[in-house]
């Protein structure tokens, strides 16, 4: 299986569904197909209201039954642990793969949690996180934000992934914007020396 490194915002925007859910047990092989499915308990939907329509929730997450076909293998045995699942909708079913952005909710920084609930959506369809995996790399468009975590940190999990979103600054320009407290806030006043 091959997976491209993915910024959380890209995962959010490229997914049909983003939910919080708990895995309820071991996967069940679906006979005569190349799939298995995990029973899940959805606790919150963060993206996908339009795509889903009347559906109130998803009982199963479908994934290829083989790792070579990018099948997802759920390793946690803790049924009370809540996961963020960014998946695709196919024939009315939630599909996930080994490449899906799928992490324990508590592993996300508060800034990322807030972004999945609210902020990332503002960049979808407008801005593009453009991966820089080898130097030199340059922006191809003003709507792109250059993602350099792989170069600078040697990993897709870096400062831009954890703390920034690529958002419209104006109709023609996207820039990295800090997800936490404003970086431009004034410093506390220095105490006068005695």
């Amino acid at each position: 299986c091959s997976c491209a490194p993915t910024h959380p915002q890209t995962a959010f925007c490229n997914s049909d569904l983003v939910i919080r859910a708990k895995f309820m047990g071991s996967p069940e092989i679906i006979e005569t197909t190349l799939y298995q499915r995990y029973e899940i308990k959805m606790t919150k939907m963060l993206k996908g209201f339009d795509a889903v329509g009347n559906a109130t929730g998803f009982r199963f997450a479908y994934t290829p039954a083989m790792e070579s076909l990018c099948g997802y293998v759920h390793k946690s045995q803790n049924r009370s642990e809540e996961f963020l699942i960014a998946g695709r909708l196919r024939n009315g079913n939630l599909h996930i793969t080994a490449c899906s952005f799928l992490v324990p909710w508590h592993n996300l920084s508060p800034a990322q949690q807030k972004a999945f609930v609210k902020t990332y959506s503002a960049g979808c369809g407008v801005c593009t996180v453009f991966p820089c995996s080898a130097i030199p790399c340059k922006l191809e468009s003003d709507s792109h934000c250059l993602w350099t975590d792989q170069i600078l940190m040697g990993s897709e999990k870096g400062y831009q992934s954890d703390h920034f979103a690529c958002l419209p600054r104006n109709p023609d320009l996207c820039t990295w914007q800090y997800l936490g407290v404003s970086m431009t806030r004034s410093l506390p006043l220095a105490k006068a020396e005695a």
């Epitope: 091959s2 083989m66 695709r88």
Partner: antibody, heavy 121, light 110 residues
Framework: QVQLVQSGAEVKKPGESLKISCKGS????????IGWVRQMPGKGLEWMGI????????RYSPSFQGQVTISADKSISTAYLQWSSLKASDTAMYYC??????????????WGQGTLVTVSS | DIALTQPASVSGSPGQSITISCTGT?????????VSWYQQHPGKAPKLMIY???NRPSGVSNRFSGSKSGNTASLTISGLQAEDEADYYC??????????FGGGTKLTVL
């Protein structure tokens, strides 16, 4: 690097049997599905079936179920496609290819060079 | 099998851009999000050019690009060159995970 090497061209008469092969190298042969694809002269690609050499789990396209047999010998990293009784309409180029996952996609990422089978009286 | 429909032939002059379409029959949401494209020169094995609608494997020219709108995926070749003359096939997979091919499109470079 990943390589799939197929057996050579075959000329057969109707009613004869045939077994063609596809040897994999450069990757873990038992961990990936191998598919067989038919291309009749001047026509498009048709998926025939796939096999998982690790446990010989085999799935056939409905169009080819009962017409051919797909097998594998994992000890020599080789997959096979065989006919018990050939027909003139089996004349075609046959490709083996590795069935693989890319992100959410399922596709054939590496192909053998093809085996031309000619059936004529 | 699910039918993926492609035009039988397209043509273009060197330097031009051409687009080949691949239409699925299902209207299910995301039913054809997953489309790959193969190039096949006469007498040769197919070669993967695009996967997951718009991604290029390493080594494939950036003149090749993929996109999707509604139920139709498209392969666009810009700056057409003589060596692009070949047959092109789209491929997806059905709800069981099994592969499905389009009928193929013959590209002629005039």
């Amino acid at each position: 690097q990943v390589q799939l090497v197929q057996s050579g061209a075959e000329v057969k008469k109707p009613g004869e049997s045939l077994k063609i092969s596809c040897k994999g190298s450069g990757y873990s042969f038992t961990s990936y599905w191998i598919g067989w694809v038919r291309q009749m002269p001047g026509k498009g690609l048709e998926w025939m079936g796939i096999i998982y050499p690790g446990d010989s789990d085999t799935r056939y396209s409905p169009s080819f179920q009962g017409q051919v047999t797909i097998s594998a010998d994992k000890s020599i990293s080789t997959a096979y496609l065989q006919w018990s009784s050939l027909k003139a309409s089996d004349t075609a180029m046959y490709y083996c290819a590795r069935y693989y996952g890319f992100e959410y996609d399922l596709l054939f990422d590496n192909w053998g060079q093809g085996t031309l089978v000619t059936v004529s009286s | 099998d699910i039918a993926l429909t492609q035009p039988a032939s397209v043509s273009g002059s060197p330097g031009q851009s051409i687009t080949i379409s691949c239409t699925g029959t299902s209207s299910d949401v995301g039913g054809y999000n997953y489309v790959s494209w193969y190039q096949q020169h006469p007498g040769k094995a197919p070669k993967l050019m695009i996967y997951d609608v718009s991604n290029r494997p390493s080594g494939v020219s950036n003149r090749f690009s993929g996109s999707k709108s509604g139920n139709t995926a498209s392969l666009t070749i810009s700056g057409l060159q003589a060596e692009d003359e070949a047959d092109y096939y789209c491929q997806s997979y059905d709800i069981s995970g099994y592969p499905v091919f389009g009928g193929g499109t013959k590209l002629t470079v005039l």
